[in-house]
């Protein structure tokens, strides 16, 4: 007699997770009389897959009707694949004894498992960061295999260089994670800025799955100050304005101080949004010069996201105003945009508020 | 391990029916072909008809086909070969047995089910 | 139908001699390669039990002093050397069509 040949046609079959698997094994001949059983893996810890002769396996059909005459073929389905089910099954078949006994195997087929990454995450910096610092942005996706995938960084669609990938993990495995670092430098224009992080593999059939964060929950943009005083009215008050610009977010406190006296404190709410995504604002102090003796010494300070204040100040010189004159004063305007105070001399006399 | 227990031993007249039930035990009942064969006393063995459980397709010795009728029941695992219109000489050991190869041959039997058709 | 004739209907032999048991089909028996006969051992009291599958295999737990061959229409089982134990009845089944047995052989010790 011919020996007996259990043939498993494909060395390697690919199915998407959810569909089915069909793995083939045909016998050449109807002898012996004895069970096929599939198992997944080789050796003492092989996991048995299908017994056609006993043993209950839901999601495992015999391809053809085992109850047919002279039937050799021994092809099984394996319903609703996931990435747990790859690995290399064995047709093995047995001589019918008590009990079965292993006669021969057939030379495995290799399943493996196409499984979509799930859709990327990005998570940013846990605190914003001020402009023209560098900030790093991450991105995860999980469970998908084959372990080739490509991962890219944009910048408002510009690809981003200063980039760290990992693959994990590095050996063989049902699934696979990738985990991406993208060092992003802000800018002041970066407010509606977004980054994406975009995944491409084999299951996606060249369209790609996108993660996003906006850079607006990154970043922190810190205002510009300008102090200036306007005319001299005919009352004797002069308007001082403290205009604060191009800041992000929206939390700020200002407070005037009067020779370093708080006079007011204000907080800002419902500002209207610059085209750049930052804010404005402006506060006003009108100081009745007449009022005072000495020169004054007003402070705009103000206190942007928590960060330390910054200040400018404004000196006005009570002499340059005669008392019965309501004439312009020629303001010395000077001074830095920095934190702590700066002097900026100009003249007024005693002061009176008035807030918007 | 593989077993057909079959139901005990019966006494009918003639003219009336029996049911001989068979319970299979240590395979995939529905896996394989069950044969039903008969032995009248000293004689040898006739084949009667055989049925797949997974779908109760059967095949009918043409001597049986009016008379006999094969049914399974697969939440009992359990196969029935009932007999109608009882005659003397149908007195016989009435076997069961599991069709292990697709070959239509029998594997494994029962320990058989002697019924007897007495007036 | 095809029809199985079995010869002899009853066999003595010596023990430790050979006994040959023949079936011969009204038509052949073979297909795509196979013989369809089995050949049955049945002791008083007890069912039948297979012996050989497919005219020359013989199955799991039985003796190798048991053969068979043969092929379209005459089919032999043979016993090399009879054993007390050996005394049954045989009976050869076809499966070409629908199964069909042999009268049957009773061997007995002379």
């Known amino acids: 007699e011919e020996e007996l040949q259990v043939i498993q046609p494909e060395k390697s079959v690919s199915v998407a997770a959810g569909d089915s698997a069909t793995l083939n094994c045909t016998v050449s001949s109807l002898i012996p009389v004895g069970p096929i059983q599939w198992f997944r893996g080789a050796g003492p810890g092989r996991e048995l897959i299908y017994n056609l002769k006993e043993g209950h396996f839901p999601r495992v059909t015999a391809v053809s009707d085992p109850t047919k005459r002279n039937n050799m073929d021994f092809s099984i389905r394996i319903s609703n694949i996931t990435p747990a089910d790859a690995g290399t099954y064995y047709c093995v078949k047995f001589r019918k004894g008590s009990p079965d006994v292993e006669l021969k195997s057939g030379a495995g087929t290799e399943l493996s498992v196409r499984a979509k990454p799930s859709a990327p995450v990005v998570s940013g910096p846990a605190v914003r960061a001020t402009a023209e610092h560098t900030v790093s942005f991450t991105c995860e996706s999980h469970g998908f295999s084959p372990r080739d995938i490509t991962l890219k960084w944009f910048k408002n669609g510009n690809e981003l260089s200063d980039v760290q990938t990992n693959v994990d993990p590095a050996g063989k495995s049902v699934s696979y994670s990738i985990r991406s670092t993208a060092r992003v430098l802000l800018t002041r224009r970066d407010v509606h800025s977004q980054v994406i992080c975009e995944v491409a593999h084999v299951t996606l059939q060249g369209d790609p799955l996108r993660g996003t964060a906006n850079l607006s929950e990154a970043i922190r943009v810190p205002p510009f100050l300008e102090v200036t005083q306007q005319s001299m009215r005919a009352d004797n008050q002069v308007n001082v304005t403290c205009q604060v610009t191009k800041f992000y977010p929206q939390r700020l406190q200002l407070t005037w101080l009067e020779n370093g006296n708080v006079s007011r404190t204000e907080m800002a709410s419902a500002l209207p949004e610059n085209k750049d995504g930052t804010y404005n604002w402006t506060s006003w102090l009108l100081v009745n010069v007449s009022a005072h003796r000495d020169d004054v010494k007003l402070t705009c300070q103000v206190e942007h996201d928590g960060q330390p204040a910054v200040n400018k100040s404004f000196s006005v010189k009570v002499s340059a105003h005669p008392k019965e004159q309501g004439s312009n004063t020629a303001a010395e305007n000077t001074g830095t945009n920095e934190r702590g105070s700066s002097d900026y001399k100009d003249d007024d006399d005693k002061h009176h508020h008035h807030h918007h | 391990q593989v077993q057909l227990v079959q139901s005990g031993a019966e006494v009918k007249k003639p003219g009336a029916s029996v049911k001989v039930s068979c319970k299979a035990s240590?395979?995939?009942?529905?896996?394989?072909?069950i044969n039903w064969v008969r032995q009248a006393p000293g004689q040898g063995l006739e084949w009667i008809a055989m049925?797949?459980?997974?779908?109760?397709?059967?095949h009918y010795n043409q001597i049986f086909k009016d008379r006999a009728t094969l049914t399974t029941d697969t939440s009992t695992s359990t196969a029935y070969m009932e007999l109608r219109s009882l005659r003397s000489d149908d007195t016989a050991v009435y076997y069961c047995?599991?069709?292990?190869?697709?070959?239509?041959?029998?594997?494994?039997w029962g320990r058989g089910t002697l019924v007897t058709v007495s007036s | 139908d095809i029809v199985l004739t079995q010869s002899p209907d009853s066999l003595a032999v010596s023990l430790g001699e050979r006994a040959t048991i023949n079936c011969r089909a009204s038509?052949?028996?073979?297909?795509?390669?196979?013989?369809?006969i089995f050949w049955y051992q049945q002791k008083p009291g007890q069912p039948p039990k297979l012996l050989i599958y497919l005219a020359s295999n013989l199955d799991s737990g039985v003796p190798d002093r048991f053969s068979g061959s043969g092929s379209g229409t005459d089919f032999t089982l043979t016993i090399s050397s009879l054993q007390a134990e050996d005394v049954a009845v045989y009976y050869c089944?076809?499966?070409?069509?629908?199964?069909?047995f042999g009268q049957g052989t009773k061997l007995e010790i002379k």
């Open positions: 240590g395979y995939t009942f529905t896996n394989y072909w």
């Open positions: 049925i797949d459980p997974s779908d109760s397709e059967t």
């Open positions: 038509k052949s028996v073979s297909s795509s390669g196979y013989n369809y």
């Open positions: 047995a599991m069709d292990y190869g697709s070959l239509y041959a029998m594997d494994y």
């Open positions: 089944q076809h499966s070409r069509d629908l199964p069909t």
